[in-house]
Amino acid sequence: MEDFNMESDSFEDFWKGEDLSNYSYSSTLPPFLLDAAPCEPESLEINKYFVVIIYALVFLLSLLGNSLVMLVILYSRVGRSVTDVYLLNLALADLLFALTLPIWAASKVNGWIFGTFLCKVVSLLKEVNFYSGILLLACISVDRYLAIVHATRTLTQKRYLVKFICLSIWGLSLLLALPVLLFRRTVYSSNVSPACYEDMGNNTANWRMLLRILPQSFGFIVPLLIMLFCYGFTLRTLFKAHMGQKHRAMRVIFAVVLIFLLCWLPYNLVLLADTLMRTQVIQETCERRNHIDRALDATEILGILHSCLNPLIYAFIGQKFRHGLLKILAIHGLISKDSLPKDSRPSFVGSSSGHTSTTL
């Protein structure tokens, strides 16, 4: 944020007799006074361009990686497992989000110059990506739990059910992201670059807290608990039964979940601290405000980085993904068929045998 000088003729004239004693930093200040808080954000000019470079790299990696993942899954029609369908949706979510990164990058440098429509759409895609991501991972954990702990294929056999679950996830993600679509807009302030943020009039702070606590609970904490429960029991079953093959088959899924947590947990913890501070549970100070703002910026980069990491996990840990990719390359004559591994099967990351479906 650039330096600005708000020197006024007198404070009585500046406030026009308004009682602003209850206004708190940025979240409650009306748009025309957004730049008036005396706790100034620290200018981090260097970080601005570092962030743009990160965004550009993530954009390219995500575009390439997720496109390949979708291609491989769509090609392997025959042995496609339930988990593959979830991973296909996961790749789609990441791909859609990646498409918005150039806009976010530009806004880091010039402020929000794209107007309210793009502010709503791009913010919506970002939120939907996050929520659909964790909900899909929760569904994968339930699927693995049912397949390994209860040795059931009820979900795997009913393809329409899986499609319904995926559609429901997208619907629920849209619902959780709805506040962003309704309330985000371009906010113009004197001497400060325009910003894309929630504006709900005089009750902005209260609404923002409610609209942050609800999605954080249902969109992050609940799926997280589901995942911990399912994988806890799945791991216990695998260790007790000494199922080496299935244990290996879980590596990709565990890696996907672990990376998701490493990328999104820090951001959500900082967001929680920010929420506690804004709701006066912990005292707000200028120092804390600045530290939290910087932490939000840093941890948000981690979250954004997540959209390009899943394809890398599949490439380095998922044997079947590599095989599937090689198969596509061989079909199109880009590599010789002799270089294909002997056990190269069409499935992307899974095969079904007996009553369980193993994912690798």
Epitope: N5, F11, A36, P38, C39, E40, C286, N290
Partner: nanobody
Framework: KVQLVESGGGLVQAGGSLRLSCAAS????????MAWFRQAQGKEREFVAA????????KYSDSVQGRFTISRDNAKNTVYLHMNSLKPEDTAVYYC??????????????????WGQGTQVTVSS
Amino acid sequence: KVQLVESGGGLVQAGGSLRLSCAASGRAFNYYVMAWFRQAQGKEREFVAAISTRGSMTKYSDSVQGRFTISRDNAKNTVYLHMNSLKPEDTAVYYCAADPRGSSWSFSSGGYDYWGQGTQVTVSS
């Protein structure tokens, strides 16, 4: 927590100038909104001027606007009050105050957590 020590007060002729300094000890001075208040004998403590954390925004009371200038040097942990064209009615004890929140401009003494001992400024006619 921050400790504040004012200096630079004294006796000055009407129309003269003075520069008050407020040295802060303690951490994170650059995160405090700083202000000057004054209290004349038998009167309430009144707001004089305030400055934002990085010094790019300032606020003044009507009575000192155009004559007084508040500034800060975060590297030296010091805030200054440059007083020009002094009048007899500027005679008071001048206090330095610090607000760790900075959520909004505060023009009453209740908005500031930390205070100095004060420095006497006397303007003779």
